[in-house]
């Protein structure tokens, strides 16, 4: 099985606001899992609508 | 493809100022740190600081901390190295870099001398 | 984190086969790269991730881990491959680099 994310590395521990820091595999890039009632890129605002 | 483009080679006085640019191609900045590296003449490499582009949040290397300034304009996708009080320890070449997992990316350098 | 490249320079021979060291003093799973410097010019990027070789870098390249361990390989040492190694691990901050491995010719 392929996973298509990776932890991020220790330098990324503060790249997503409220959410857990993914980095996915085939972009090369980190990314943000955002925490229930956060939105955006860095899971930075709230989610106004949960 | 991306591509880091460095700022041209600067011959400067001790005590100025100067500010080297890296244009990010291929890349939106915004999508992960972007880091300065300097390389002394026959000497190793040396982390300066890094950048997050969407915040403007930064993080230097002790040693650094008041010598380097780290800023980035997301709207040229462009980060910038900046120093003050310049001496001849400064003379180098800065390198800007974003580094991936499975791959990497650096920029061509910017040779910076200091003399009068 | 610190990275320790155990020689500082290396005597090979043209074909021979060469290992290029490099322990770190924490565990930076795999956020690992290589690096080969030529006198003059910027470090060229080999391998990150520990095992990925970099688009256009001969296949004769190779990086392997093992722990805290990490290992640059060179199947047949070419005239061109003659140049200083570093390592680098981008697991925390601050990036930290190895002293370097200088290849010099018997």
């Known amino acids: 099985v392929v996973s298509h994310f990776n932890d991020c590395p220790d330098s990324h521990t503060q790249f997503c606001f409220h959410g857990t820091c993914r980095f996915l595999v085939q972009e090369d890039k980190p990314a943000c899992v955002c925490h229930s009632g956060y939105v955006g890129a860095r899971c930075e605002h709230a989610d106004l609508l949960a | 493809e991306v591509q880091l483009q460095q700022s041209g080679a600067e011959l400067v006085r001790p005590g100025a100022s100067v500010k080297l640019s890296c244009t990010v191609s291929?890349?939106?900045?915004?999508?992960?740190?972007m880091h300065w590296v300097k390389q002394r003449p026959e000497q190793g490499l040396e982390w300066i600081g890094r950048?997050?582009?969407?915040?403007?949040?930064?993080k230097y290397a002790p040693k650094f901390q008041d010598k380097a300034t780290i800023t980035a304009d997301t709207s040229s996708n462009t980060a910038y190295l900046q120093f003050s009080s310049l001496t001849s320890e400064d003379t180098a070449v800065y390198y800007c870099?974003?580094?991936?997992?499975?791959?990497?990316?650096w920029g061509q350098g910017t040779t910076l001398t200091v003399s009068s | 984190i610190q990275m320790t490249q155990s020689s500082s320079s290396l005597s090979v021979s043209l074909g021979d086969r060469v290992t290029i060291t490099c322990k770190a003093s924490?565990?930076?799973?795999?956020?690992l790269a290589w690096y080969q410097q030529k006198p003059g010019n910027a470090p060229r990027l080999l391998i990150s991730?520990?095992?990925n070789l970099k688009t256009g870098v001969p296949s004769r390249f190779s990086g392997s881990a093992s722990g805290k361990d990490y290992t640059l390989n060179i199947t047949s040492l070419q005239t061109e491959d003659v140049a200083t190694y570093y390592c680098?691990?981008?697991?925390?901050?601050?990036?930290?680099f190895g002293g370097g491995t200088k290849l010099e010719i018997k």
């Open positions: 924490e565990h930076i799973n795999s956020w």
């Open positions: 870099t974003r580094m991936g997992l499975r791959r990497g990316y």
């Open positions: 680098q691990q981008y697991w925390g901050t601050p990036w930290t």
């Open positions: 991730g520990a095992t």
């Open positions: 291929g890349f939106n900045i915004k999508d992960d740190y």
């Open positions: 950048i997050d582009p969407a915040n403007g949040h930064t």
